[in-house]
């Protein structure tokens, strides 16, 4: 849960319900402009471990659309454009918060949910397992 | 905002407040095990564009701790361990949802906020600008 400092002048809450259920204002304060990740940069194409972004939609979740990265190659792309299979393209994963409608289909009731998404790919040196 | 299917059996809401403010259950449903990103994999160290993870803490935000990646080099690490400055290490950024206490210090009232975080780094071919 969340550590909860108390303060007068806050919206009222009943202790039996608290802090499990809170009020959340959905008028998002956006510190950055929200874009399709493909438009925000072309790193997915210029990387030595390039990736594609796959759209996943779920109307019971907010945000309803998330993008998952999938590496294009098992290896990494060399300067000549060929793939080096002595290196590995791997997904970088990030845990994110989403809101899940609960009960289902309800417009104004949600549960916080953590999900793991792949954001992009990076090129790593493989771990070599030496057999005795 | 959120597309809002209506359903009987949902918690009640007043139209004047709706759907700007919703109820959110903070008992997080965690689809994946939550870990310090350093422990989840060692890609940050094995990548050709390695990064360090910096802890960012804000008690007025949930999650209060987020980890920001910072690329270690301007270039990318070659097989011999030297840095190739003909390539660039760049951060992969992801827009995430956080809850911001509003009004400040209130335990049970939040506003949804989108912030941009750097999740890791990838190695890209630089864009070369040719001067006429």
């Amino acid at each position: 849960g969340i550590a909860i400092p108390r303060n007068s002048g806050c919206p009222n809450s009943e202790d039996k319900n608290f802090p499990r259920t809170v009020m959340v204002n959905l008028n998002i304060h956006n510190r950055n402009t929200s874009t399709n990740p493909k438009r925000s940069s072309d790193y997915y194409n210029r990387s030595t471990s390039p990736w594609n972004l796959h759209r996943n939609e779920d109307p019971e979740r907010y945000p309803s659309v998330i993008w998952e990265a999938k590496c294009r190659h098992l290896g990494c792309v060399k300067a000549d454009g060929n793939v080096d299979y002595h290196m590995n393209s791997v997904p970088i994963q990030q845990e994110i918060l989403v809101l899940r409608r609960e009960p289902r289909h309800c417009p104004n009731s949600f549960r916080l949910e953590k999900i793991l998404v792949s954001v992009g790919c990076t090129c790593v040196t493989p771990i070599v397992h030496h057999v005795a | 905002g959120i597309a809002i299917p209506r359903n009987s059996g949902c918690p009640n809401s007043e139209d004047k407040n709706f759907p700007r403010t919703v109820m959110v259950n903070l008992n997080i449903h965690n689809r994946n095990t939550s870990t310090n990103p350093k422990r989840s994999s060692d890609y940050y160290n094995r990548s050709t564009s390695p990064w360090n993870l910096h802890r960012n803490e804000d008690p007025e935000r949930y999650p209060s701790v987020i980890w920001e990646a910072k690329c270690r080099h301007l270039g990318c690490v070659k097989a011999d361990g030297n840095v190739d400055y003909h390539m660039n290490s760049v951060p992969i950024q992801q827009e995430i949802l956080v809850l911001r206490r509003e009004p400040r210090h209130c335990p049970n009232s939040f506003r949804l906020e989108k912030i941009l975080v750097s999740v890791g780094c990838t190695c890209v071919t630089p864009i070369v600008h040719h001067v006429a």
Epitope: N45, N56, I66, I115 | N32
Partner: antibody
């Protein structure tokens, strides 16, 4: 050595449910998308379901959407296929496959599911 | 949805011959931003699981003999087996995958 081993097949009555499992070894499971493919007796290959490496994104063809659910447990290196409201046309050998990238580079031996009364 | 049409459906060959299997898609499988064709070829021998031969239209999977050659771009693709051997008798499938997966109906390679 990469291995994918399916289990959970057998005879099931129409309208009933069945859950298939696929235990994998020999690779870092949570780096790869996984897919179930099926093959009806004497027929071609048909896509059944796919799941992203994190498990957060799933994809289905219209023929099974709403009846089948793909899931994974990365801690156990196991892929699942929950099949509900089974029909006779779901009778097939079900293959667990690894998506190398945009191709299926490793396949399990397959498990037979027979839907019949 | 993308439809993959394979031809011929069956093919009778003698060992040593060169055979060509065609696969035509209803939409282009070439992604301009990645400069790749999302097409793969599989071989399935009787009683066995399918095996990956070719991916991205022309890249041979590790361990696959060089007599298997994939070619084509956009909507028209070809699998060529030069100098067919008895062990090559199998069903061959083309396959497209991006978000969804689509397979051709298969081409059965038989002995003449």
């Amino acid at each position: 050595e990469v291995q994918l081993v399916e289990s959970g097949g057998g005879l099931v009555q129409p309208g009933r449910s069945q859950k298939l499992s696929c235990v994998v070894s020999g690779f870092t499971f949570n780096n790869y998308w996984m897919t179930w493919i099926r093959q009806a007796p004497g027929k071609g290959l048909e896509w059944v379901a796919s799941v992203s490496n994190t498990g957060s994104s799933t994809y289905y063809p219209a023929s099974v959407k709403g009846r089948f659910t793909i899931s994974r447990d990365n801690a156990k290196s196991t892929l699942y296929l929950q099949m509900n409201s089974l029909r006779s046309e779901d009778t097939a050998t079900y293959y667990c496959t690894r998506e190398g990238a945009y191709y299926l580079d490793y396949w399990g031996q397959g498990v037979m599911v027979t839907v019949s009364s | 949805d993308i439809v993959m049409t394979q031809s011929p459906s069956s093919l009778a060959v003698s060992p040593g011959e060169t055979v060509t299997i065609n696969c035509k898609s209803s939409q282009s499988l070439f992604w301009s931003e990645s400069h790749m064709n999302y097409l793969a070829w599989y071989q399935q021998k009787p009683g066995q699981s399918p095996k990956l031969l070719i991916y991205y239209a022309s890249t041979r999977q590790s361990g696959v003999p060089d007599r298997f050659i994939g070619s084509g771009s956009g909507t028209d693709f070809t699998l060529t087996i030069s100098g067919v051997q008895a062990e090559d008798l199998a069903v061959y499938y083309c396959h497209h995958h991006y978000d969804s997966h689509t397979f051709g109906a298969g081409t059965k390679l038989e002995l003449k």
